[in-house]
Amino acid sequence: QPDAINAAVTCCYNFTNRKISVQRLASYRRITSSKCPKEAVIFKTIVAKEICADPKQKWVQDSMDHLDKQTQTPKT
């Protein structure tokens, strides 16, 4: 779970150790603040839960790519 260290900055201290199917993911944001101990990706899931993930993992990169494509494709 991400932790808010103040109103503006949210950090991740632990990463999920289990891959989540992209079907269960709604969006993501990157955490790159120097105030945080590590770079991270926070996925927002279909049930509105935020989950910290390691941006170095392939499934995380693939999921971000997939979500990027989804947002670029206009819904008809």
């Epitope: 289990r18 989540i20 199917s21 079907q23 269960r24 899931t45 049930v47 509105a48 989950i51």
Partner: antibody, heavy 119, light 109 residues
């Protein structure tokens, strides 16, 4: 430890309806779902449908579409399964089972409710 | 709908022997979202394996899962008397459409 406790056995007449409840305790309810699985005597497991509690909308196996209604009450951490137009082939043990909506495996199961349909 | 076909229907083995159960899917099971359950007479099913190969909490190490795509296997390395039961595979790719295999009964020879 998560526990799912189901309502008791039922004997029903053909054409009637049955409503089975499943009360969860010992864990969070919101980002989880409840699946309903039935097992006719001597047969395998058959998925009937499920509901993700935070959404409140259910999905059903095609076979049961129009005859089954699955609901959940977050305030009491209880899920319900109602099956209508009962026939003798609906005689079975009905199980509720919990799943994390981020994944899907059924990690905790109720004890089962025997529904007997007989005239 | 993804159809899961388990084989064999019945496996007759002695305690101490190795059991190999197969589950074949009619379509690719993405993310290896496949589980195995054990069911004993008069009891609810119990989760053994999730994500094709991860053991659930409290499950003995003699149970292992493997496979990906359309072919999955549950192996019991050395059967204990309490392992004689029915085993089911289950796919959970789509939250709106779960399916189970028809089961494999592991019985004492």
């Amino acid at each position: 430890q998560v526990q799912l406790v189901q309502s008791g056995a039922e004997v029903k007449k053909p054409g009637s309806s049955v409503k089975v409840s499943c009360k969860a305790s010992g864990g969070t309810f919101s980002h989880y779902g409840t699946s309903w699985v039935r097992q006719a005597p001597g047969q395998g497991l058959e998925w009937m449908g499920g509901i993700i509690h935070i959404f409140g909308t259910a999905n059903y196996a095609q076979k049961f579409q129009g005859r089954v209604t699955i609901t959940a009450d977050e305030s009491t951490s209880t899920a319900y399964m109602e099956l209508s137009s009962l026939r003798s082939e609906d005689t079975a043990v009905y199980y509720c089972a919990r799943y994390d909506a981020h994944y899907g495996e059924l990690d905790f199961w109720g004890q089962g409710t025997l529904v007997t349909v007989s005239s | 709908e993804i159809v899961l076909t388990q084989s064999p229907a019945t496996l007759s083995l002695s305690p101490g022997e190795r059991a190999t159960l197969s589950c074949r899917a009619s379509q690719h099971v993405s993310d290896a979202y496949l589980a195995w359950y054990q069911q004993k007479p008069g009891q609810a099913p119990r989760l053994l394996i999730y994500d094709a190969s991860d053991r659930a909490e409290g499950v003995p190490a003699r149970f292992s899962g493997s496979g990906s795509g359309t072919d999955f296997t549950l192996t019991i390395s050395s059967l204990e008397p309490e392992d004689f039961a029915v085993y089911y595979c289950h796919q959970y790719i789509h939250l709106h459409s779960f399916t189970f295999g028809q089961g494999t009964k592991v019985e004492i020879k």
